[in-house]
């Protein structure tokens, strides 16, 4: 089942995806597609990177993080209801059937007429692996930082913890987005 992320119409949506490059600048190809991950590659590609750079993108889709350090999280600009659905992040680690694939569900909510301020929370008590939060303004996306050497297995485990936790539900209900990695 997919991890669910939420955004409001008119806001930027954030879909997290990370890997740890074997060495700085030793990148692996990554593709993002609209729709669940197929058997190979991505369907309906919206953005892709190769071993050096972002080499394909479509309007409104970009990488906000440092993809050279393995942050290949997707930002979708100025979302509409049509942006709802499953997105595939595929990390094409070289080798025999080594790909890591993540299906992320994006739910777009209609814009609030009167936006309520985001509640402050103490995340470190619930998730001691995580550091402090950044970006507390009501119009900003709330972001959690974490240890830089987290691996893909930890990411998957952490994603499951977050998905299954009441904290994650509370965060989603308040319109905030959790960044893993």
């Amino acid at each position: 089942s997919e991890v669910e992320y939420r955004a409001e119409v008119g806001q930027n949506a954030y879909l997290p995806c990370f890997y740890t490059p074997a060495a700085p600048g030793n990148l692996v190809p990554v593709c993002w597609g609209k729709g669940a991950c197929p058997v190979f590659e991505c369907g309906n590609v919206v953005l892709r990177t190769d071993e050096r750079d972002v080499n394909y993108w479509t309007s409104r889709y970009w990488l906000n993080g440092d993809f050279r350090k393995g942050d290949v999280s997707l930002t979708i600009e100025n979302v509409t209801l049509a942006d709802s659905g499953i997105y595939c992040c595929r990390i094409q680690i070289p080798g025999i059937m080594n790909d890591e694939k993540f299906n992320l569900k994006l739910v777009i909510k209609p814009a609030k007429v009167t936006p309520a301020p985001t509640r402050q929370r103490d995340f470190t008590a619930a998730f001691p692996r995580m550091l402090t939060t950044r970006g507390h303004g009501p119009a900003e996306t709330q972001t959690l930082g974490s240890l830089p050497d987290i691996n893909l297995t930890q990411i998957s485990t952490l994603a499951n913890e977050l998905r299954d936790s009441r904290l994650a539900n509370d965060l989603r209900d308040s319109g905030a987005t959790i960044r893993i990695g």
Epitope: V39, F40, E51, Y56
Partner: antibody, heavy 121, light 107 residues
């Protein structure tokens, strides 16, 4: 015009090895994933292997994993399938096929004419 | 492995008829289904991908539909050159798997 021409098939004894080749022309070979698909004497189609455009990633079903190896030489516009420890059930016509992927993964949009592999004692 | 159950195995038709071939996936495959046509002595030729998108040059009388687990290839106004074997394939998850085929024959 896209062309895929397979070669290297033949009769081989169980436990033997064979190397198939596929010569590609009419398109930018290094911009496509490539696959091998086989068709059994009963006319069933079976996916055998797929390789990424750079050759860095390879994919196999369990039935041939550890026995077959797909590879490519982009400088020579060539695709290969090294088949070891062959079994009677590997008897089939082997097709090489092109897989577009850049903006949307699409399986096998062009196929070669096939090369026949017979495994028998 | 996802099993693609294709029906019928054989279908008799006449020129001008409308025929449908179905494929049922044993698991959810979204719209990751392709259809291929194979004439005797030839290699398979792609007709449809993403369940309903025709490949370049494929006549409009070939229509694909379905999503999830149930898929259909419809040939309206069958022509004599359509007499062939038709295969579905799922490319949602590994291993990529094919249906057993449907042979379209003249009555």
């Amino acid at each position: 015009e896209v062309q895929l021409v397979e070669s290297g098939g033949g009769l081989v004894k169980p436990g033997g090895s064979l190397r198939l080749s596929c010569a590609a022309s009419g398109f930018t070979f290094s911009s496509y994933y490539m696959s091998w698909v086989r068709q059994t004497p009963e006319k069933r189609l079976e996916w055998v292997a797929t390789i990424s455009n750079s050759g860095g990633s390879t994919y196999y079903p369990d039935s041939v994993k550890d026995r077959f190896t797909i590879s490519r030489d982009n400088a020579k516009n060539s695709l290969y399938l090294q088949m070891n420890s062959l079994r009677a059930e590997d008897t089939a016509v082997y097709y090489c096929a092109r897989d577009p992927y850049y903006t949307n993964y699409v399986p096998m949009d062009y196929w070669g004419q096939g090369t026949t592999v017979t495994v028998s004692s | 492995s996802i099993v693609m159950t294709q029906t019928p195995k054989f279908m008799s038709t006449s020129v001008g008829d409308r025929v449908s071939v179905t494929c049922k996936a044993s698991q959810y495959v979204d719209t990751y289904v392709a259809w291929y046509q194979q004439k005797p002595g030839q290699s398979p030729k792609p007709l449809i991908y993403s369940a309903s998108t025709r490949h370049t040059g494929v006549p409009a009388r070939f229509t694909g539909s379905g999503s999830g687990t149930d898929f259909t290839l419809t040939i309206s106004n069958v022509q004599s050159e359509d007499l062939a074997e038709y295969f579905c394939a799922q490319y949602s998850s590994s291993p990529l798997t094919f249906g057993a085929g449907t042979k379209l024959e003249l009555k």
